[in-house]
């Protein structure tokens, strides 16, 4: 299922303390996500079918709306409030991905169950970074900016859209997963 | 990149006052927090109230400003701060500022600030 | 609700001397500290932010150290355009409904 659009209100009171060596866990979920990206991507422009797979530059080119910036340069604080604002964007549009995968191409089943294992990665990934923030930062709260919604928009649209989504994501997992 | 206050006024206790800030050289797609300062004569700073200038338009307000002050996103490049019910202790040079988005970024762009005046 | 101390209330010392400026938050706020430095009829400028990185064009005779609850501003090789007024401030966002945003009371 895809994150919940609103993330969790928090107060930087910790319930649980954080996983052991957290920067490791966050680093290696970078790596398993980025390490998977490559065959998300070929999975969904093959999925989408013609003119697609032919039209990557034109069509999967990872020109997004409004994506929140990454400074590879910053301090570990930045690059985790970074990191967060990313990955909230990313998982809200691959929530809509997979709806609309859903409904556009219902017998494409292992393109959902991968979408579906990104979007548990980026879960658990979410709570690591937001608990070192609230532990070492005393931040409990991460203003956050949404991707485009695709509800109303037509089928080729939809398609364009997710392809272009998943072109960044791929170009910027990388990037994350280097900087960590 | 510039911001710019509308200019103060000289209103009555009671009244109610809007101030906009107009932002210059950049727009509110890159991902900030507008704020509101203010400065009563001779003293110090006071921060007022800020909204993120992301899609969620959070907003956030000083425990004192709450309930009689309003800050809003009117659009890609204004954001308006409204002052209900004034007294004359709100009298004090307005400024607005453009704040970084990780925490410990402060405000590294400011207006020049305008008075506004609450006497009978 | 976070009160930011800083002492202190105003300082005098002579060209070329050194100065420095303390705040306290009275709960630990970690690095998300900010210095400024006011001259008379105009807006706050930024100096230091995250406790002790720069802000762009500041000369490196201002110094920013400190983390938790205690900051401090060092002002060294002092010039005359020194002469002004320095306020610390929290930045940070705690929880969704709360904006750690005060100011110190500032040192002239």
């Known amino acids: 299922s895809p994150l919940p659009i609103t993330p969790v209100n928090a107060t930087c009171a910790i319930r649980h303390p954080c996983h052991n060596n957290l920067m490791n866990q966050i680093r290696s979920q970078l790596a398993q996500l980025n390490g998977s990206a490559n065959a998300l991507f070929i999975l969904y422009y093959t999925a989408q079918g013609e003119p697609f797979p032919n039209n990557l530059d034109k069509l999967c080119g990872p020109n997004v709306t409004d994506f929140p910036p990454f400074h590879a340069n910053g301090t570990e604080k930045a690059k985790l409030v970074e990191l967060y604002r990313i990955v909230v964007y990313l998982g809200t549009s691959l929530g809509n991905i997979t709806r609309d995968q859903k409904i556009l191409n219902p017998s494409a089943l292992s393109l959902h169950s991968k979408l579906n294992a990104t979007a548990d990665i980026l879960r658990g990934l979410l709570s690591n970074v937001l608990c070192r923030l609230c532990s070492k930062y005393h931040v409990g709260h991460v203003d956050v900016t949404y991707g485009p919604d695709t509800s109303g928009k037509d089928v080729f649209q939809k398609k364009k859209l997710g392809c272009q989504l998943l072109g960044k994501y791929k170009q910027i997992i990388a990037v994350l997963a280097q900087a960590f | 990149e510039q911001l710019e206050e509308s200019v103060g006024d000289l209103v009555k206790p009671g009244a109610s006052l809007t101030l906009t800030c107009t932002a210059s050289?950049?727009?509110?797609?890159?991902?900030?927090?507008m704020c509101w300062v203010r400065q009563a004569p001779g003293k110090g700073l006071e921060w007022i109230a800020c909204?993120?200038?992301?899609?969620?338009?959070?907003t956030y307000y000083a425990t004192w400003a709450k309930g009689r002050f309003t800050i809003s996103k009117t659009s890609s490049t204004t954001v308006t701060l409204q002052m209900t019910s004034l007294t004359v202790a709100d009298t004090a040079t307005y400024f607005c500022a453009r704040g970084g988005g990780v925490p410990g970024d402060g405000y590294a762009l400011w207006g020049p600030g305008t008075l506004v005046t609450v006497s009978s | 609700e976070l009160v930011m101390t800083q002492t202190p209330a105003s300082v005098s010392e002579p060209v070329g001397g050194t100065v420095t400026i303390n705040c306290q938050a009275s709960?630990?706020?970690?690095?998300?500290l900010v210095w400024y430095q006011q001259k008379s009829g105009q807006p706050p400028k930024l100096l230091i932010y995250d406790a002790s990185m720069l802000a762009s064009g500041v000369p490196s005779r201002f110094k920013g150290s400190g983390s938790g609850t205690q900051f401090t501003l060092t002002i060294s090789d002092l010039e005359c355009a020194d002469g002004a007024t320095y306020y610390c401030?929290?930045?940070?966002?705690?929880?969704?409904?709360?904006?750690?945003?005060?100011f110190g009371g500032g040192t002239e």
């Open positions: 709960e630990d706020i970690s690095s998300n």
């Open positions: 401030q929290s930045y940070y966002v705690a929880s969704s409904s709360y904006f750690v945003n005060g």
């Open positions: 909204i993120w200038t992301g899609s969620t338009d959070s």
């Open positions: 050289g950049f727009s509110f797609s890159g991902l900030y927090y």
